[in-house]
């Protein structure tokens, strides 16, 4: 089941999927001056069986000015600019993508690909949010949103990530104070604090991370 809407927009934050559920579609979009080859795929589709998932179809772009297809090569990294799924300013890898059954990895780029990727997500897809460069999160840990089916309609859970701007303390933006307590949650603390995916830090993809403030029933 495809999700009706896009993941929520969070001020001063971008989102990224670490892996894509089977059934996810990626539009074959070309950059300005290029178009899909005739008889070329409209989209790539994440398909698979119990042991392996991969992207079906290949996207191919050709110059709008020519009729013959161009040879497909993987572009250099610098040719790939600001794709929606790769806007994160720093690495965010809660899990090894390959270790998640029923999911595809990020598809490799294709020649003359558009600068922004357009995905069509399916129910159960999870995306992670991170503050953009120059902003910092009020809370620690990944903020995620999940596409869920409720009463026959799809909706994305709302991450409560807050990204704040200019600093008011003497500390420089690049400096990180050392954590005063370990990453793991103390065993004696069995309840969680708030809210939503903003604070729900223990996820199917990050089982060793900390849980949220109130209860996961908030989901």
């Amino acid at each position: 089941e495809l999700c009706d809407d896009d993941p929520p927009e969070i001020p001063h934050a971008t989102f990224k999927a670490m892996a894509y559920k089977e059934g996810t579609m990626l539009n074959c979009e070309c950059k300005r001056g290029f178009r899909r080859i005739k008889s070329g795929s409209l989209y790539m589709l994440c398909t698979g069986n119990s042991s392996h998932s991969s992207w079906d179809n290949q996207c191919q772009c050709t110059s709008s000015a020519t009729r013959n297809t161009t040879k497909q090569v993987t572009p250099q990294p610098e040719e790939q600019k600001e794709r929606k799924t790769t806007e994160m300013q720093s690495p965010m890898q809660p899990v090894d993508q390959a270790s998640l059954p029923g999911h595809c990895r990020e598809p490799p780029p294709w020649e003359n690909e558009a600068t922004e990727r357009i995905y069509h997500f399916v129910v159960g897809q999870m995306v992670y949010y991170q503050c953009v460069q120059g902003y910092r999160a009020l809370h620690r840990g990944p903020a995620e949103s999940v596409c869920k089916m409720t009463h026959g309609k799809t909706r994305w859970t709302q991450p409560q990530l807050i990204c704040t701007g200019e600093m008011e303390t003497s500390q420089f933006p690049g400096e990180e104070k050392p954590q005063a307590s370990p990453e793991g949650r103390p065993e004696s603390e069995t309840s969680c604090l708030v809210t939503t995916t903003d604070f729900q830090i223990q996820t199917e993809m990050a089982a060793t991370m900390e849980t949220s403030i109130f209860t996961t029933e908030y989901q």
Epitope: H12, R136, H139, E166, E189
Partner: antibody
């Protein structure tokens, strides 16, 4: 069970100082931004200050900027508010709150009067 | 003066539906920040009633619902009960203050 317990309130003269504390339990304190919010008698809620999960940045309402200082000790699961140069208009119940803020303590009353 | 604007009072009879509005600006609700609603019973601390515009914490009855559009939000209470008599506050993060802002509060009276 999540608990936030404020202490340190009381009667103080104008120009005086107080230090409020908020002891947190039942959740991973070091992962959440924390707030101080106050409520003057018979009035609404007014945000006072916020501190990030690691204490690396802090913000203040204009009404308290330069007089109040928020801090936290993650090893003690405790949030603090140092209040200097207190004025009559600072009289209020002071709540510490976690997250959205979505979980609140019961509050501690600060009275500034001569 | 509060950054978010709420009506100071609202009332209804048991069983009725009442709505409380909350109007903000382009630096808070209009900037895309979530709206949260709190219920404060007399002599107690505020309690989170609705978070992220329309989500209910566990334990909050489905008589309470929230919505958001543009620079405004609203809280609806259906099947009004006497125990709903309380002060209700909306709140949202404000990018110009780098902190949450609150509405002035709405005193709900159940007639």
């Amino acid at each position: 069970e999540v608990q936030l317990l404020e202490s340190g309130g009381g009667l103080v003269q104008p120009g005086g100082s107080l230090r409020l504390s908020c002891a947190a339990s039942g959740f991973t304190f070091s992962s959440y931004g924390m707030h101080w919010v106050r409520q003057a008698p018979g009035k609404g809620l007014e945000w006072v200050s916020v501190i990030s999960y690691d204490g690396s940045y802090k913000y203040y309402a204009d009404s308290v900027k330069g007089r109040f200082t928020i801090s936290r000790d993650n090893s003690k699961n405790t949030l603090y508010l140092q209040m200097n140069s207190l004025r009559a208009e600072d009289t209020a119940v002071y709540y510490c709150a976690a997250g959205v803020p979505d979980y609140w303590g019961q509050g501690t009353l600060v009275t500034v009067s001569s | 003066q509060s950054v978010l604007t709420q009506p100071p009072s609202a009332s209804g009879t048991p069983g009725q539906r009442v709505t409380i509005s909350c109007t903000g600006s382009s630096s808070n609700i209009g900037a895309g920040y979530d709206v949260h609603w709190y219920q404060q019973l007399p002599g107690t601390a505020p309690k989170l009633l609705i978070y992220s515009n329309n989500e209910r914490p566990s334990g909050v009855p489905d008589r309470f619902s929230g919505s958001k559009s543009g620079t405004s939000a609203s809280l609806a209470i259906s099947g009004l009960r006497s125990e709903d008599e309380a002060d209700y506050y909306c709140a949202a993060w404000d990018s110009s203050l780098n902190g949450p802002v609150f509405g002035g509060g709405t005193k709900l009276t159940v007639l």
